[in-house]
Each structure stands twice: as structure tokens, then as C-alpha cells.
């Protein structure tokens, strides 16, 4: 018995060939001997089967002795043994129809689980293997689960269903809802304007939800909500904003926040959360702000940084075009009695400058002693 695998919703063509290359009488029946279709001369006739409106043949092939049964919009319950009767012969074809669907939704938040469920006819024992867009393979029976979805899992999943050494392939598009970056860090000199951007890693027709930026300043004992906002069809509207600092927010995507000026008391880390309509859970992006200040007080030139810096970052003070006078893996460095000239305060990581602040030291003239 020939086995043919079909996909739910697709069209399948079951073949039936006569030895005579001419149009002769044929008919297709199901396993209950109910007629599906046949011919009467050059006319297609249909029987009382449940396939009535979805069954067809190709009249153009009849003259060549080919009498296919075409079933459109396949359903799992179409799985059956189909019998073609032609020239006093019976050809049997077993049709097995499978469906593969993603749990509830194909748009899932980063970190959530994806479950793929196989619909299969009774009595079948298929195996399923799926490949993610990054090439990860998973194997299973009637269900396959992937926990902790990552951004790279966004895209087309290819799944193969194997049954009776035959296979049918499904492609499912999965969208992982996430920010492009899990974390970002902004380095600014004191007084500079700060731009925070939160680009999304996906595009959807309509995007609705609400969000909030919580901020933990390095100098503060607890975190504070800096801004809350709504998102309606990709339009951003601010609901509530603190007075200090008074953040401004862009009205369009990507989510964009502006801090008028970087000050030591704002240095720290924030967590932007975005709750999307009809989704359980939230998207998160961490953002960090490091602020640098260079000051001269009497005979002391000081450079300081505030905010979440890694222990391997180097803070240096140097006179322009000269070697560094002081370099330390600390958050403050200073030089006593600095020479006159343009001094540079540098925050660097393995030689790469992340932040630079210049300060001019004027020459000190010794005042003559009065007689």
C-alpha cells in the first residue's frame, strides 16, 4: 500500500494510473467504500462523501490513463485509505495528514517558552525534528518545547515530520519580542545632554502597551520611577514624569529619552520595562549612565567618575601630548600643583577611550612680597 503524507490546509494529489493510455471508467472510494468521485464519459461525477466540495480530478490527464484524486484544504480527518478502481484493478493509497502549530501565538516574549504541537491521525506514530533560525535542532513526539527563547530564535523554524520513512516539512515563523540590546551604557561629561535609545528587535503592524523607566542612582538608597508612558499603535505618550530630572520622550518608535544634562546625582542604572497588550510578561532593557567631572580647586586638579564602571576601567589625568601623570583603576584621581596647560581626564578600557574631559590650568603668578 502506497503511503502519502499531507499537510493540514494544503492540497494533495493521489495518483492512479491505468495500463491503457486512454480515458476509461474509474472511481475513487474511501475505506468505507463510499464513492468520492469518478467519471461518466468525459464528465466528473461526485459521490456522497464528506470530501464532496474539496475533491477534484484532472480531466486533462484522463486521456493519458491518469486519474488523480485531488483533495484541497486538507484536514486531519481526511487521513484514510483511498481506493482507486480502474480496469478491474484496485489501487490503495494511505493518506496521512499532519498539522503543526505553535502554542497560542507565534509572537513570544524573550525568555518565554515555545511549544510546537503536532496534530496527527489516530494510529500514526510520527517523530518530529525542528531546526531553529540559528540552526539549533530539537526532537520530540507529539509536542516539542523550547524554554527560554532568545532573540536569535526569531525567524523561520523548519520542522520535519517523519512517518513510515516518509516526511513532510513545515515552516513556522516565530517572532521573539525583545529589545535589540539587553543592556547599554552611556558615558557623558557633566553638563552634557544624554540620549537613551531603546530600539526593538521586531516590527509589528500595531504595537500597543505601556512602559516605565525605573532609576537607581549610585548616590541614592532606593530606586525611583523617572517616567511612565503609553504606547498606542506605535505612538508614544508620556503619562507621568519626575520633576528632577525632567526627562523628555520622543513621540515615535524607537523609544527615545533625553536627559537635559548629565549630573553626578543621576549617574547609575535604569531598567526600562515595556508591557505589551495581550502579552503576559514584560520586555526589559537595562541602561547605565556614567558621568565624568574634572575640577580644579586651589592646588588640586581632580577627575571623578560616577556610575556603574567595571573594575578594569582606567582613569587617567595627563597634560596634553604628554604621558599620563596619574592612572588608576579607581573612580577618582588627582594631581597636586598641576603644571599650566590643557589637562585631559580619560576613562579608558584596554586603551580605548570611553570618555574624555578637558580642563585648562592657568599659570599661577607668584605675587611679590610688599616691603
Amino acid at each position: 500500500k502506497k503511503v502519502v503524507l499531507g499537510k493540514k490546509g494544503d492540497t494533495v494529489e493521489l495518483t492512479c494510473t491505468a495500463s491503457q493510455k486512454k480515458s476509461i471508467q474509474f472511481h475513487w472510494k474511501n475505506s468505507n467504500q463510499i464513492k468520492i468521485l469518478g467519471n461518466q464519459g468525459s464528465f466528473l461525477t461526485k459521490g456522497p462523501s464528506k470530501l464532496n466540495d474539496r475533491a477534484d480530478s484532472r480531466r486533462s490527464l484522463w486521456d493519458q490513463g491518469n486519474f488523480p484524486l485531488i483533495i484541497k484544504n486538507l484536514k486531519i480527518e481526511d487521513s484514510d485509505t483511498y481506493i482507486c478502481e480502474v480496469e478491474d484493478q484496485k489501487e490503495e493509497v494511505q493518506l496521512l495528514v499532519f498539522g503543526l502549530t505553535a502554542n497560542s501565538d507565534t509572537h513570544l516574549l524573550q525568555g518565554q517558552s515555545l511549544t510546537l504541537t503536532l496534530e496527527s491521525p489516530p494510529g500514526s506514530s510520527p517523530s518530529v525534528q525542528c531546526r531553529s533560525p540559528r540552526g539549533k535542532n530539537i526532537q520530540g513526539g507529539k509536542t516539542l518545547s523550547v524554554s527560554q527563547l532568545e532573540l536569535q530564535d526569531s525567524g523561520t523554524w523548519t520542522c520535519t515530520v517523519l512517518q513510515n520513512q516518509k516526511k513532510v516539512e513545515f515552516k513556522i515563523d516565530i517572532v521573539v519580542l525583545a529589545f535589540q540590546k539587553a543592556s547599554s551604557i552611556v558615558y557623558k561629561k557633566e553638563g552634557e545632554q544624554v540620549e537613551f535609545s531603546f530600539p526593538l528587535a521586531f516590527t509589528v503592524e500595531k504595537l500597543t502597551g505601556s512602559g516605565e523607566l525605573w532609576w537607581q542612582a549610585e548616590r541614592a538608597s532606593s530606586s525611583k520611577s523617572w517616567i511612565t508612558f503609553d504606547l498606542k499603535n506605535k505612538e508614544v505618550s508620556v503619562k507621568r514624569v519626575t520633576q528632577d530630572p525632567k526627562l523628555q520622550m520622543g513621540k515615535k518608535l524607537p523609544l527615545h529619552l533625553t536627559l537635559p544634562q548629565a549630573l553626578p546625582q543621576y549617574a547609575g542604572s535604569g531598567n526600562l520595562t515595556l508591557a505589551l497588550e495581550a502579552k503576559t510578561g514584560k520586555l526589559h532593557q537595562e541602561v547605565n549612565l556614567v558621568v565624568m567631572r574634572a575640577t580644579q580647586l586651589q592646588k588640586n586638579l581632580t577627575c571623578e567618575v560616577w556610575g556603574p564602571t567595571s573594575p578594569k576601567l582606567m582613569l587617567s589625568l595627563k597634560l596634553e601630548n604628554k604621558e599620563a601623570k596619574v592612572s588608576k583603576r579607581e573612580k577618582a584621581v588627582w594631581v597636586l600643583n598641576p603644571e599650566a596647560g590643557m589637562w585631559q581626564c580619560l576613562l579608558s578600557d584596554s586603551g580605548q577611550v570611553l570618555l574624555e574631559s578637558n580642563i585648562k590650568v592657568l599659570p599661577t603668578w607668584s605675587t611679590p612680597v610688599q616691603p
Epitope: 540552526g135 535542532n137 523548519t158
Partner: antibody
């Protein structure tokens, strides 16, 4: 019987373009990925990338991204590997293979590409 | 990228010998490993998939084992036609990568 038949050997000059082919038969060509593998003279096998002829979805190895283009014409069950500007270092045997979710279960006979001035 | 390291690089053996080739992945790849045989001037041929499943038509003297990072290909009783180069390949994540090969020669 599953078969992958590749185009014949090619001798080219540096800077020239080239497109080699791989014709599949004996199976549903649009339902399997097709991969390309390079084997430089006296060396091992290198995975270049794959294509799904059903919708021309492609994935490249970072080592070959931008160096070659993989394409397919499902109407004639043929996959292609092409170069816009060949280099002497492209001299190698190139194999196409049917990819059964990562495993290359059937291979073409190989196309030898020689690039020399 | 996941690196695949085969050992030994070459191996001399006699007909009837039991031979083992190992393949180590730079990170865990579950059982997503295949073994191929390549004879001179020929295309590679698939022997084993999913670390231990024998490809249809491949003699039962070939077997594979292992999971995670360490894998082996064993030929229980070497036949004259088995002298060839053997490659392992991971298909756990892109880019799928091959080992450098093990050349099996007649002693």
C-alpha cells in the same frame, strides 16, 4: 532514487565570475535544504551555507558570507553557488548535498573549480 | 563557532582490526553529530547521524556513540573497502562545522 547532479569542472581567471549548479531529482526538491561544502586541495570539508529552495531562505557560514551567493530555481529543481570575482584561493572542489535538518544525507559528485592566471 | 577536533589525524591498521576514531566538540552539542566517509576523488558518504544512528545501507560493523562533547566512531572489523578519510560534523548550531578528518591507512 535521490540524485544530486553538479555541473562540470571550471577553469577561470582571477576576477572572473562563475555560477555552478546542482540539480536535484528523485525527491521533493522544495522540501529539503540544500547545502554547499568546500574542499580545498588536500584539505578537509568546510560548511559554506544552505538554501531552502521552497522559499529561497538562506543561511551562510560567517567565513563565506559576502564571498559567495547561494540561490535556487525551484521550477527546475536546481541550486546554485556563485562568485562575482574569483580569487586563486577559491580553487577547490565544491559539493552540494541534501540537508536533512543538518545531516548531509545525499551528496553531489562535486565540481572542481580552478582559478589561475 | 563550535570547533570539532578529531583524533588521531591518521591511523594505520590491518584488515580485521577494531578501530576507534574520536571527535571532540568545543561545547556541548547534545547528540547532533554525523560521521562521513570519503574515499579519494569521491564525494563524502553519510555513515552515522544523531551520534549513533546508522544510515540505511551502511554495514553494521560501523557504530557511533557519545553525547555532549565526546564522540566515537568504531569499525568493529576493518574491511579493505573501509580505508578512507573519516569526518565528524556537528549540526547543533550554525555554522555547522566538520572535524579536520582522520585518514585510515593500510598497515
Amino acid at each position: 532514487e535521490v540524485q544530486l547532479v553538479q555541473s562540470g569542472a571550471e577553469v577561470k581567471k582571477p576576477g572572473e565570475s562563475l555560477k555552478i549548479s546542482c540539480k536535484g531529482s528523485g525527491y521533493s526538491f522544495t522540501g529539503y535544504w540544500i547545502g554547499w561544502v568546500r574542499q580545498m586541495p588536500g584539505k578537509g570539508l568546510e560548511w559554506m551555507g544552505i538554501i531552502y529552495p521552497g522559499d529561497s531562505d538562506t543561511t551562510y557560514s560567517p567565513s563565506f558570507q559576502g564571498q559567495v551567493t547561494i540561490s535556487a530555481d525551484k521550477s527546475i529543481s536546481t541550486a546554485y553557488l556563485q562568485w562575482s570575482s574569483l580569487k586563486a584561493s577559491d580553487t577547490a572542489m565544491y559539493y552540494c548535498a541534501r540537508d536533512q535538518l543538518g545531516l548531509f544525507d545525499y551528496w553531489g559528485q562535486g565540481t572542481l573549480v580552478t582559478v589561475s592566471s | 563557532d563550535i570547533q570539532m577536533t578529531q583524533s588521531p589525524s591518521s591511523l594505520s591498521a590491518s584488515v580485521g582490526d577494531r578501530v576507534t576514531i574520536t571527535c571532540r566538540a568545543s561545547q556541548g552539542i547534545s547528540s547532533w553529530l554525523a560521521w562521513y566517509q570519503q574515499k579519494p576523488e569521491k564525494a563524502p558518504k553519510s555513515l552515522i547521524y544523531s551520534a549513533s544512528s546508522l544510515q540505511s545501507g551502511v554495514p553494521s560493523r560501523f557504530s557511533g556513540s557519545g553525547s555532549g562533547t565526546d564522540f566515537t566512531l568504531t569499525i568493529s572489523s576493518l574491511q579493505p573497502e573501509d580505508f578512507a578519510t573519516y569526518y565528524c560534523q556537528q549540526y547543533d548550531s550554525y555554522p555547522y562545522t566538520f572535524g579536520q578528518g582522520t585518514k585510515l591507512e593500510i598497515k
